[in-house]
């Protein structure tokens, strides 16, 4: 039997059976959430489950830029620190990068200090680039 | 007042090489990057590169890689690009323009360009 | 990819009309689209930034949209003024590069 990959939009890239689009324009992160909603098939703020799926993102992010932090999927939304994927993903694979996680930061970013193989938290009202996720 | 001045209008024979400066002022030099842009007579415009004088990264058009170097000088606030090789086909204008340091939101001043002409 | 513009526009005055920017391949909403005016004899000048911002002094008659269907961005001006015409230029990013699209020369009747 041939087994086809599904195809992803145009511009988004394809990792195991995943579809991820990284998006150069800077939103807040509920803004960032809405505008990965808004391409439907159940797209939201990247969830990032593996090392493996981490180091792929970082790599193809990689070719585009080093320095600027992307929003990933990944909030506070009690600011109790119990953070969640907005996706409902299970939040079992970690990758923090051991910076402090307190004051007014409940959103989780990919940072640029560790080529986005590590997390940070921010503001969520910052102004970044993000990383959307959908499975076609 | 943000400004940036170019050197004047260059004529270069096939071959040789170029050199034009564009000086900033008005702003933090080190907090934009310098692109490099020109247009040939009647033509469109076309980005040649990107300098960033905070960390001197640099990004050339595939076109011109091997031919086109750009540099800074973080001291007097001046951005250099030099095109090698001249041919008759770079007979252009070219213009200096600031971009915000990883902001993809393009170039909000342009100096008022260089006419560089290459004739033999 | 490719950035690709009408030629030529050409309308009267008082009227309104729209300039296309269409990407040939991947998706023109991952990165701002900016549009540039450009007189005779003069160096470019931004009017629309990260897609439909106007910088301070730009007049509201310039308006910017992104078009995702179609993967196109368009300027749009209204009322337009004889001060209007000359070339636009569209300009977005593929990675490292920054990329221009042809240029549309508007003549205003």
């Known amino acids: 039997d041939i087994i086809m990959r599904p195809s992803c939009a145009p511009g988004w890239f394809y990792h195991k059976s995943n579809c991820y689009g990284y998006f150069r324009k800077l939103r807040n992160w509920s803004d960032a959430e809405l505008e990965c909603q808004s391409y439907g098939n159940g797209a939201h703020l990247a969830s990032i489950l593996s090392l493996k799926e981490a180091s792929t993102i970082a790599e193809y992010i990689s070719g585009y830029q080093r320095s600027q932090p992307i929003w990933i999927g990944l909030h506070d939304p009690q600011k109790r620190q119990q953070w969640q994927w907005i996706d409902g993903a299970m939040y079992l694979y970690r990758s923090w990068s051991g910076k402090s996680m307190g004051g007014n930061k409940h959103c989780a970013e990919m940072s640029s200090n560790n080529n986005f193989l590590t997390w940070s938290s921010n503001e969520c009202n910052k102004r970044q680039h993000f990383l959307c996720k959908y499975r076609p | 007042e943000v400004q940036l001045v170019q050197s004047g209008a260059e004529v270069k024979k096939p071959g040789a090489s170029v050199k034009v400066s564009c000086k900033a002022s008005?702003?933090?030099?080190?907090?934009?990057?310098i692109n490099w842009v020109r247009q040939a007579p009647g033509q469109g415009l076309e980005w040649m590169g990107w300098?960033?004088?905070?960390?001197?990264?640099?990004n050339y058009a595939q076109k011109l890689q091997g031919r086109v170097t750009m540099t800074t000088d973080t001291s007097t606030s001046t951005a250099y690009m030099e095109l090698r090789s001249l041919r008759s086909d770079d007979t252009a204008v070219y213009y200096c323009?600031?971009?915000?340091?990883?902001?993809?939101?393009?170039?909000?001043?342009w100096g008022r360009g260089t006419l560089v002409t290459v004739s033999s | 990819f490719m950035l690709t513009q009408p030629h030529s526009v050409s309308e009267s005055p008082g009227k309104t009309v729209t300039i296309s920017c269409t990407a040939s391949?991947?998706?023109?909403?991952?990165?701002?689209v900016q549009w540039y005016q450009q007189r005779p004899g003069s160096a470019p000048t931004i009017v629309i930034q990260?897609?439909?911002?106007?910088p301070s002094g730009v007049p509201d008659r310039f308006s910017g949209s992104i078009d995702r269907s179609s993967n196109s961005a368009s300027l749009t001006i209204s009322g337009l003024k004889a001060e209007d015409e000359g070339d636009y230029y569209c300009?977005?990013?593929?990675?490292?590069?920054?990329?221009f699209g042809g240029g549309t020369k508007l003549t205003v009747l």
């Open positions: 990260e897609d439909n911002q106007r």
């Open positions: 391949s991947g998706n023109i909403a991952f990165n701002y």
């Open positions: 008005g702003y933090t030099f080190t907090s934009y990057g």
């Open positions: 323009a600031r971009e915000e340091t990883g902001s993809y939101h393009g170039f909000d001043y």
């Open positions: 300098i960033s004088p905070y960390n001197y990264n640099t």
């Open positions: 300009q977005s990013y593929d990675k490292y590069y920054r990329i």
